[in-house]
């Protein structure tokens, strides 16, 4: 196993409608044909898997069907969306990128980006 | 240039189980997925699963659990799907598309299921 | 799964004229990919990630949409065009097509 620089964003503010997007790079040493990319999610120290998608030649990230994730792919840039946040999703998340084929394979852990959500304020009772 | 090509059309019996190929040429076969897919006579289109040639990861449609198995022979760039305990549903054409983008498509494969 | 509802399933073209297959997602898709099958023959990629045309695919074809409503449109049908259009998303699995769209040129 071979280790590779993976860069994101140190922080991103989720919007009002729970949705947090960020850029997760990759230094690759080579022309990888199969990558797999998976997001980590830090908070009070355990480690939990958000999503994970493995790509091709293509640039749209396929999920599994129950993901609250969405991505497209252009070089070794994966630009990632999660969606469905709220404010307990608060937490840090972690991208990890393994470049499975050809060989050798590289596995790169980036640093992660924090994610803050906040819930949205109920909207005041109106008379107009 | 890219091309596609399946094995020759399949008549087996109720029970039986069923290997297709498809034979991949004019292009690096380890950089994408080759996606099988079912249609049945007059019906829409089945993604079945898909596999990647170099590493053998594989994803399935969860209808089609237990009944396909997908592997490739990166050496003879082939992939293969292994239909089992087959019945009359599994009648049907088989295709295998290259890629994300299912750009290329082979002829298809006819399997009929008759006792 | 994300289903993918088409409408119409059949319809009726005149060449020269103008039509517009709906496809309809379960769910918001990245993105959504267009085939065009002809009877006795293997499906063709004619668009992919929503608007963009396949290799040798006539400009007469275009794709458009976001979210959960797609549409493909062909400005000036002619009488090859008579085939099943399949739409497809790819954002998750399984992936998944619409159930066709038969368009006759008559």
């Known amino acids: 196993c071979k280790a590779m620089h993976v860069a994101q964003p140190a922080v991103v503010l989720a919007s009002s409608r729970g949705i947090a997007s960020f850029v997760c790079e990759y230094a690759s040493p080579g022309k990888a044909t199969e990558v797999r990319v998976t997001v980590l999610r830090q908070a009070d120290s355990q480690v939990t898997e958000v999503c994970a998608a493995t790509y091709m030649m293509g640039n749209e990230l396929t999920f599994l069907d129950d993901s609250i994730c969405t991505g497209t792919s252009s070089g070794n840039q994966v630009n990632l969306t999660i969606q469905g946040l709220r404010a307990m999703d608060t937490g840090l998340y972690i991208c990890k990128v393994e470049l499975m084929y050809p060989p050798p394979y590289y596995l790169g852990i980036g640093n992660g980006t924090q994610i803050y959500v906040i819930d949205p304020e109920p909207c005041p009772d109106s008379d107009f | 240039q890219v091309h596609l090509q399946q094995s020759g059309d399949v008549l087996v019996k109720p029970g039986a189980s069923v290997n297709l190929s498809c034979k991949a040429s004019g292009y690096t076969f380890t950089s994408y997925w080759i996606n099988w897919i079912k249609q049945r006579p007059g019906q829409g289109l089945e993604w079945?699963?898909?596999?990647?040639?170099?590493?053998?990861?594989?994803y399935y449609n969860e209808m089609f659990t237990g009944k396909a198995t997908l592997t490739v022979v990166t050496s003879s760039t082939t992939a293969y799907i292994h239909l089992s305990s087959l019945s009359f549903e599994d009648s049907a054409v088989y295709f295998c598309a290259r890629g994300d983008y299912f750009d290329y498509w082979d002829q298809g494969t006819t399997l009929t299921v008759s006792s | 799964q994300i289903v993918l509802t088409q409408s119409p399933a059949i319809m009726s073209a005149s060449p020269g004229g103008k039509v517009t297959i709906t496809c309809s997602a379960s769910k918001s898709v990245s993105y959504i990919h267009w085939f065009q099958q002809k009877p006795g023959t293997s499906p063709k990629l004619l668009i992919y990630d929503t608007s963009t045309l396949a290799s040798g695919v006539p400009a007469r074809f275009s794709g458009s949409g976001s979210g959960p409503s797609y549409s493909l449109t062909i400005s000036r049908v002619e009488a090859e065009d008579a085939a099943t259009y399949y739409c497809?998303?790819?954002?998750?699995?399984?992936?998944?097509f619409g159930g066709g769209t038969k368009l006759e040129v008559r």
């Open positions: 079945i699963g898909r596999i990647a040639p170099g590493s053998g990861t594989t």
């Open positions: 497809q998303q790819r954002t998750t699995y399984p992936l998944t």
